[in-house]
Interface confidence: low
């Protein structure tokens, strides 16, 4: 082992250095001292460094351990924010869009159902929209609304042009009749399945986006404890004591540090992995009846549909209904008073689909991409830390905590370090109760994310198919028919779909650099000048 | 009244790259979709690209995809479209235009033209 | 693809329409352009929407996937090359048709 260099007699350049720290010279000694009352940098000789010295290292120490985590989550702060935010807009978007072609559609084919039928639907893509966004709102109960507002409009204007004014009051009569009679044959509850299923999707894709930005905040701003901080004004700092000014940490010391102040974090890591893996499940599930897009832009195809549905059987309903809401607003009806025959829907069933275009679902696998580059982010911190703060290479000729040495051994260190501080202590210690806390909400979403995740393969639910919706012949010119007659699959339509282009430039190189990070006390990162890694906040 | 005034045409050699700007004026900026549209000699319109009100959406024709970048600025009122890897192919009249809300039905949903700036690719 | 025809000729003071079809929205505008290079003028937007600046005597209908674009009362000032533009896919947002030349007899 060499002798350490002949220490600095008048702890010269150690003054200039903590200058920069914490601006007079106050606390330094102007020579060496024997240093008993020092807690961490604990002197094997004589010391530049005082009780006061040691306490501002230590504060230093925690600020750049916590600016290299910032550092260090900057990129998938950064892509998981954006996405969280182009994701939402879109989804808007596509709300929007929806609304436009329903109400399009009214306007051109029912005039006469316009201004109200424009309420109704304003209504229904409000609460979608609210939906989204995680309001408690029941779907069913969303296009129940739609349907129950809808039909006393269609009864009295397009049915029943003439009805006096004073057969008018017999709204509720017809809302009621809507559903006992199912006026709207199988549409609603077909809409209800579409809707809820990919809405469902939709919401928890966002919930899960921005509990990933919760749990990056979570580990970004978490404040070290004391222990770690000793640990690393160790390995930072002690070594200035000394007038080693321009010795490096070991690689395998600052390995070690880390894993002892990151084991609390380190502890997200199984969770971080399931829950991108999740979340891949979810997203590869995210087509036909559960992608948003899909199904909401084909819904005004679907209304339609519905109302031509009702005129095709306008001659029957109208007596039933007329016999039914005649003098009275009270439901004295009951489902039994129409014909069984009435109502049979053997209407083809038209999913919007479009073959695999630059769509939303190709911006979420892109996404998907970018996560899984990260699976291993948490695990990986430590490693990811050391190497971009300043350490040694190979090990030699660096500090190990306590002394200047040709080559790095644990095994000293651990032992060198026992009187002093107790790694495993710190380990056992478990994480912070913030870290406890976005734990649970990542078991939670992951929980929700897995019950969410579809089969692969089939178009609707089992429970779907049972509803005796039939998948008909592939006639229409505009329709084009996926997979045979006899394996559950149903007729699509081709939807347009607008966001093809939706912004998504999200390189790192639009990544806010480390220049425009927010860093409180630049003076105190200082002390590494030139040791810095270029990416480190430490430079 | 709706004015849209686009600048930066001229002689541009092939593979260079040309930076076109539309400065607009007469209606709320922010709340409006904006276009691009070029016209070859003899030819007819083309869309080139769109972006959305707030800038965060943005269309691109197969034609320009990967070279052409369009962005807004609401506080100057300005939209810029950046083309790069210029080809011959790209020489015509290119015309600013104006989206009749902020999310505009593209092409259908044009309101208001710029009288156009012509760019030349040649070398 | 935006299909239109190539040229239609109404006499003065008749009505013509051209017609345009094949764009998958559903949504289309119509663009007049009195000579190449000169600026377009927006005649119809969304299917039938006028801008306040444009004579009555221009409408717009849109049944299916086919748009119409009429002139009642067509007037020497008309004479133009008429552009339909719709959207045909999320790979092709925003699309136009050839052009229709009107001449006015």
């Known amino acids: 082992q060499p002798p350490p260099p002949p220490p600095d007699a008048t702890c010269h350049q150690v003054r200039s250095f903590f200058q920069r720290l914490q601006p007079g010279l106050k606390w330094v000694p102007e020579t060496p001292v024997p240093g008993s009352d020092l807690q961490v940098c604990l002197p094997k000789g004589p010391t530049c460094c005082s009780r006061k010295m040691e306490e501002k290292y230590q504060l230093t120490a925690r600020l750049n351990m916590e600016q290299l985590l910032q550092s260090a989550s900057m990129e998938l702060k950064f892509l998981i924010i954006q996405n969280a935010a182009v994701f939402q807009e879109a989804f808007e978007i596509v709300v929007r869009h929806a609304k436009n072609y329903t109400n399009a559609m009214f306007k051109n084919n029912y005039p006469s159902l316009t201004p109200q039928a424009f309420e109704f639907v304003g209504e229904f893509f409000t609460d979608v929209s609210l939906y989204i966004l995680g309001s408690d709102i029941n779907v069913d109960d969303m296009v129940n609304e739609l349907f129950d507002s809808l039909f006393p409009v269609i009864y009295t204007q397009l049915m029943n042009p003439g009805l006096p004014d004073s057969a008018l009051d017999i709204n509720e009569c017809l809302r009621g009749a809507r559903r006992d009679l199912k006026v709207f044959g199988n549409f609603p509850k077909l809409i209800m399945t579409q809707v809820s299923k990919s809405l469902q999707v939709t919401r928890i894709f966002l919930q899960a986006l921005n509990l990933g930005i919760e749990v990056i905040n979570t580990t970004d701003h978490l404040k070290f404890s004391k222990d770690c901080g000793r640990m690393l004004t160790r390995m930072w700092y002690c070594s200035y004591c000394q007038g080693l000014m321009m010795v490096k940490p070991c690689g395998g010391y600052c390995n070690v540090v880390m894993q002892g102040c990151m084991a609390g974090v380190v502890e997200i890591d199984k969770y971080w992995r399931e829950y991108i893996l999740s979340l891949e499940e979810l997203v590869n599930g995210m087509y036909r009846i559960y992608d948003m897009e899909n199904v909401l832009l084909g819904l005004f195809s679907t209304i339609h549909d519905s109302i031509q549905y009702v005129q095709k059987n306008a001659g029957k309903l109208t007596t039933t209904i007329g016999k039914l809401c005649a003098h009275s607003q009270q439901r004295q009806y009951r489902s039994a008073y129409y014909p069984e025959d009435l109502f049979i829907d053997k209407k083809v069933l038209k999913v919007a689909h479009v073959e695999h275009e630059e769509t939303l679902s190709s911006r979420r696998r892109e996404l998907i991409q970018k996560l899984k580059s990260f699976i291993s982010f948490y695990s990986a911190l430590p490693g990811y830390i050391c190497s971009h703060s300043p350490v040694a290479e190979n090990d030699t000729l660096c500090w190990n905590g306590q002394e200047l040495v040709e080559r790095y051994s644990q095994k000293a260190a651990r032992n060198g370090m026992k009187n002093q501080f107790n790694l495993h202590e710190l380990k056992m210690k478990g994480p912070e109760p913030v870290v406890s806390q976005i734990i649970d909400k990542l078991k939670h979403i992951n929980q929700l994310l897995r019950t969410m995740s579809m089969p692969k393969g089939r178009v609707l639910d089992k429970n779907l198919d049972e509803e005796g919706f039939e998948s008909g012949d592939c006639g229409d010119d505009e329709d084009e028919c996926i997979g045979g007659s006899g394996d559950g699959m149903i007729k699509v339509k081709n939807q347009l779909r607008f966001l093809a282009e939706l912004a998504y430039d999200l390189d790192v190189d639009d990544a806010p650099g480390n220049s425009q990070q927010a860093t409180p006390k630049d003076n105190e990162i200082s002390t590494f000048h030139n040791l810095g890694n270029v990416h480190s906040p430490l430079k | 009244t709706v004015t849209l005034d686009e600048s930066g045409g001229g002689l541009q050699l092939p593979g260079g790259a040309l930076s076109l700007v539309c400065k607009g004026s007469?209606?709320?900026?922010?709340?409006?979709?904006m276009f691009w549209v070029r016209q070859a000699p003899g030819k007819g319109l083309e869309y080139v690209a769109e972006?959305?009100?707030?800038?965060?959406?943005?269309y691109y024709a197969p034609a320009v995809k990967g070279r052409a970048t369009i962005s807004r600025d609401n506080g100057q009122s300005t939209v810029r479209l950046q083309l790069n890897n210029l080809r011959a192919e790209d020489t015509g009249t290119y015309y600013c235009a104006k989206g009749v809300d902020s999310d505009s039905w593209t092409a259908a949903g044009i309101d208001a033209w710029g009288h156009g700036t012509e760019v030349i690719v040649s070398s | 693809a935006l299909t239109q025809p190539s040229s239609v000729s109404a006499n003065l003071g008749g009505t013509v329409k051209i017609s345009c079809s094949g764009g998958t929205g559903r949504w289309y505008g119509w663009y007049q352009q009195k000579s190449p290079g000169s600026l377009p003028v927006t005649v119809i937007y969304s299917n039938d929407k006028r801008p306040s600046d444009i004579p009555s005597r221009f409408s717009g209908s849109t049944s299916g996937s086919t748009s119409t674009l009429t002139i009642t009362g067509v007037q020497a000032e008309d004479e133009a090359v008429y552009f339909c533009g719709s959207r045909e896919s999320s790979r092709n947002p925003g699309i136009f048709g050839a052009g229709t030349t009107l001449t006015v007899l």
């Open positions: 972006i959305s009100g707030t800038g965060s959406s943005t």
């Open positions: 007469g209606f709320t900026f922010s709340s409006f979709n």
